[in-house]
C-alpha cells in the first residue's frame, strides 16, 4: 500500500522489513556454512549477510524493503569480516541512503521518539496526581456526592488510560525499519501479551472518553434539565462510562482478529476497521463540544446578570471556560475532523504533538482543577489536619480523674454541596441551581 505520491506507508514498510528478515532467516537455514574460518550469516536488522570468509569484505545489495530501493538498486552495503572470523565494526551503508531526503526517516523517528518521551512524562505525572486526588476524594467522607463520584470515575479512567498506554509501549516492538541510529534488538516479546495490552489500551481510552461524556451529560442535566433528582441516574452513568466502550472495543477485536491480524495490532492499515473505534470517540467529542457551547451560553447569561454580582465577568468567563476545557475534553475538537490520512509532514506532527501533549497532561490538569485547588477539598483537608492536630494535643494532655474527653462534634452537613435541584422557592418557582453548580465546577 502506498500513499498518494507513491511513497510507502510506515505500516507497509514495517511489514516489508519484517518479510525481508524472515526471508533472510530461511536463506541462512538452507545455506551450508563454509569449511574454513568465517563470519556467521545473519540479519543485522538492516541487511542480510551470508557466511563470509575471514579477512574479507562482505557485499550485499541494498535491502529491497527500502522505500527508495529503485533509486539505489545498483548500490551495495559492505561489512568487514575480521581475521578471527568475527564481524568487525567496519561497515558502509552509504550507497543505500535515500538520495532525495537523506536523513528524513531519522528525523521522523527522532520527532516520534521525542513525542513518546513527552507523553511518557505527561502520563506518569497524571498517574501520580490522579492517584493522590482519588485518595483524597475517597478518604474524606464529606466529599462523597454524585458530582465527586463522577469525578472519581473520571480520574480512574484517566489512570487506566495512562497505565495501559505506558504498559503497551513497553510491549510494542521498536520503531522500524532501522536505517538510522535506532537499530533494535530482535523483538521477542510475546504477541499475546502485546495484543492484550493493545486491547486494554483501546478499552481504557474509550472509557476515558465516555467518562468525559458523562461529566458533560451530568453538568448539562444540572444546568438545563432541572427538576429531576440525580441520585438515581448514577447507576446509568456507571453503565455508560464503563459499559459503552465495550460495545465498540469488542467488535473491533473480533474484526481485527478476522480481517487484519498483523503484529501487535498497533498499525491501522485497514482504515474501515479503525473507524469502528474512531467513530464512537468522535461522536463523544462532538456531543461534549455541543454541551460545552451550551454551558458557555448559560455561563455568559449568568455572568451578565447581577445575580452573580461579578464586575470582572470577562475574566470569570475566561477562567470558567478554561476550567471546563480539560473536564470535557474540548481541546480534542481542534483536530478531531482531521484524520491522519488527510495530513502529512509538518501538519501531521503538529496534530500529533497537540493531541498527545494535551491528552497526556489532561489527567494532571483535571486532578489539579477539580481536586487540589477545589475550595471544598482544600477546606476538608484543612479541617482534617486541624482534627488530627487537636487529637494529638488532646492525647498529650493526660485526663484528670472523673474527667472525660468529649469528642468534638462534627457537623453533619456535607462539605460536598449537591446542587439544590428542585428546591421550591417562596415564590413557588423552581430555583435554578445554576449559581451553585457553576461555583462547584467553575
Amino acid at each position: 500500500e502506498t500513499d498518494s505520491e507513491g511513497q510507502t506507508t510506515t505500516g507497509e514498510l514495517y511489514q516489508r522489513w519484517e518479510h525481508y528478515g524472515q526471508e533472510c532467516q530461511k536463506m541462512l537455514e538452507t545455506t551450508e556454512p563454509p569449511s574454513g574460518l568465517a563470519c556467521n550469516g545473519s540479519f543485522d536488522m538492516y541487511a542480510c549477510w551470508n557466511y563470509t570468509a575471514a579477512n574479507t569484505t562482505a557485499r550485499v545489495s541494498c535491502p529491497w524493503y527500502l522505500p527508495w530501493f529503485r533509486q539505489v538498486s545498483a548500490g551495495f552495503v559492505f561489512r568487514q569480516c575480521g581475521s578471527d572470523g568475527q564481524w568487525g565494526s567496519w561497515r558502509d551503508h552509504t550507497q543505500c541512503e535515500n538520495p532525495e531526503k537523506n536523513g528524513a526517516f531519522q528525523d521522523q523517528t527522532l520527532i516520534l521518539e521525542r513525542l513518546q518521551i513527552m507523553y511518557t512524562v505527561g502520563y506518569s505525572l497524571s498517574l501520580t496526581t490522579l492517584l493522590l486526588a482519588l485518595l483524597i476524594l475517597s478518604l474524606f467522607r464529606r466529599l462523597h456526592c454524585t458530582r465527586n463520584y463522577i469525578h472519581m470515575n473520571l480520574f480512574t479512567s484517566f489512570m487506566l488510560r495512562a497505565a495501559a498506554i505506558l504498559t503497551r509501549d513497553q510491549l510494542l516492538p521498536p520503531l522500524g525499519p532501522y536505517t538510522g541510529d535506532q537499530a533494535p534488538t530482535p523483538w521477542n516479546q510475546a504477541l499475546a501479551a502485546c495484543r492484550t495490552a493493545q486491547i486494554m489500551t483501546q478499552y481504557c481510552v474509550g472509557a476515558n472518553y465516555t467518562w468525559l461524556l458523562v461529566e458533560g451529560v451530568y453538568l448539562h442535566h444540572l444546568l438545563v434539565i432541572v427538576g429531576r433528582s440525580e441520585k438515581g441516574h448514577f447507576r446509568c452513568y456507571l453503565l455508560l462510562g464503563w459499559g459503552a466502550p465495550a460495545l465498540f472495543v469488542i467488535p473491533w477485536v473480533i474484526v481485527r482478529y478476522l480481517r487484519e491480524n498483523t503484529q501487535c495490532w498497533e498499525r491501522n492499515e485497514v482504515k474501515a476497521i479503525w473507524w469502528i473505534i474512531r467513530t464512537p470517540i468522535l461522536i463523544t467529542i462532538l456531543i461534549n463540544f455541543l454541551i460545552f457551547i451550551r454551558i458557555l451560553g448559560i455561563l455568559v447569561s449568568k455572568l451578565r446578570t447581577r445575580q452573580m454580582r461579578c464586575p470582572d465577568y470577562r475574566l470569570r468567563l475566561a477562567r470558567s471556560t478554561l476550567t471546563l476545557v480539560p473536564l470535557l475534553g474540548v481541546h480534542e475538537v481542534v483536530f478531531a475532523p482531521v484524520t491522519e490520512e488527510q495530513v502529512e509532514g509538518s501538519l501531521r506532527f503538529a496534530k500529533l504533538a497537540f493531541e498527545i501533549f494535551l491528552s497526556s497532561f489532561q489527567g494532571f490538569l483535571v486532578s489539579v482543577l477539580y481536586c487540589f485547588i477545589n475550595k471544598e477539598v482544600q477546606s476538608e483537608i484543612r479541617q482534617g489536619w486541624r482534627h488530627r492536630r487537636l487529637r494529638l494535643s488532646l492525647q498529650e494532655q493526660r485526663p484528670r480523674p472523673h474527667q472525660e474527653l468529649a469528642p468534638r462534634a462534627v457537623p453533619l452537613s456535607s462539605a460536598c454541596r449537591e446542587a439544590a435541584v428542585g428546591n421550591a422557592l417562596p415564590s413557588g418557582m423552581l430555583h435554578v441551581p445554576g449559581d451553585e453548580v457553576l461555583e462547584s465546577y467553575c
Epitope: 569484505t57 559492505f78 568487514q80 558502509d92 551503508h93 536505517t179 541510529d181 537499530a183 533494535p184 534488538t185
Partner: antibody, heavy 119, light 113 residues
Framework: QVQLQQPGAELVKPGASVKLSCRAS????????MHWVKQRPRQGLEWIGE????????NYNEKFKTKATLTVDKSSSTAYMQLSSLTSEDSAVYYC????????????WGQGTLVAVSA | DVVMTQTPLSLPVSLGDQASISCRSS???????????LHWYLQKPGQSPKLLIY???NRFSGVPDRFSGSGSGTDFTLKISRVEAADLGVYFC??????????FGGGTKLEIK
C-alpha cells in the same frame, strides 16, 4: 540525540590503574561498537580499540593490547576502559567515540577524560 | 599500519582567505569495494573532534559548503574557501580502509596570521 558522557579528569599515581567510563544515550547502545581514542597534549589522535556492546567482543590496536582493557555494562549503557601500569606516557585525554550508524567514520565523540599521571 | 602524514603542521591564514591542508597515506586508501575511506575532522580548542568530510569529498550534515575535500589513492586535500573565525582549530585526516587499526594524521593547526 546521541550523547557520550565522560567524566572530566582522573588524577592517578604512576604504576596504578584507572577505569574510565563513557555513558551512552540517545540510541540503542548494543547496536553500535564503541571506540576509544587517545590524544596526548599537542599531538595527534591514536586509536586504542573497539568493543561490541552486544557481546563484549573487542579488538585492540597492537600498541595498546597490554595497556587497555575494554568492557561494557549493558544495563547502564556504559562502556569502560581500564588502563593499567600507568606511566607519564599515559597522561592524555581519552575519548570514547562512535561511528555514524552503518558507516566507519566517527560522528559522535565524548567530551574526553583527562588522565594525569603524577607522583 | 597505515601511516598518515599531514602538511603543513601549522597554517597561518587571514580571515576570508582560502586554506589548503594536505594529507598523504603510506599506502593506497582505495578499498576492495572501490570506495576510498579518507575522512577529515576538526578539533576546536578545548573540544572533542568533529566530523567534517567522509569518504574524501562528502560533507557531513551541518558542515558549510566552504569545506571541500578532494584526492585519490594516497594524496588528499582539504580546502576551506573563505576562512572564518569559527574554522580555527586543528584539522585531522583519518583512514578506515585498512583496519584495524584506524589511523589519524598528526594534525594541522589553522591559526590567524
Amino acid at each position: 540525540q546521541v550523547q557520550l558522557q565522560q567524566p572530566g579528569a582522573e588524577l592517578v599515581k604512576p604504576g596504578a590503574s584507572v577505569k574510565l567510563s563513557c555513558r551512552a544515550s540517545g540510541y540503542t547502545f548494543t547496536s553500535n561498537w564503541m571506540h576509544w581514542v587517545k590524544q596526548r597534549p599537542r599531538q595527534g589522535l591514536e586509536w586504542i580499540g573497539e568493543i561490541n556492546p552486544s557481546n563484549g567482543r573487542s579488538n585492540y590496536n597492537e600498541k595498546f593490547k597490554t595497556k587497555a582493557t575494554l568492557t561494557v555494562d549493558k544495563s547502564s549503557s556504559t562502556a569502560y576502559m581500564q588502563l593499567s601500569s600507568l606511566t607519564s606516557e599515559d597522561s592524555a585525554v581519552y575519548y570514547c567515540a562512535r561511528f555514524y550508524y552503518g558507516t566507519s567514520w566517527f560522528a559522535y565523540w565524548g567530551q574526553g577524560t583527562l588522565v594525569a599521571v603524577s607522583a | 599500519d597505515v601511516v598518515m602524514t599531514q602538511t603543513p603542521l601549522s597554517l597561518p591564514v587571514s580571515l576570508g582567505d582560502q586554506a589548503s591542508i594536505s594529507c598523504r597515506s603510506s599506502q593506497s586508501l582505495v578499498h576492495s569495494n572501490g570506495d576510498t575511506y579518507l575522512h577529515w575532522y576538526l578539533q576546536k580548542p578545548g573540544q572533542s573532534p568533529k566530523l567534517l568530510i567522509y569518504k574524501v569529498s562528502n560533507r557531513f550534515s551541518g558542515v558549510p559548503d566552504r569545506f571541500s575535500g578532494s584526492g585519490s589513492g594516497t594524496d588528499f586535500t582539504l580546502k576551506i574557501s573563505r576562512v572564518e573565525a569559527a574554522d580555527l582549530g586543528v584539522y585531522f585526516c583519518s583512514q578506515s580502509t585498512h583496519v584495524p587499526p584506524f589511523t589519524f594524521g598528526g594534525g594541522t593547526k589553522l591559526e590567524i596570521k
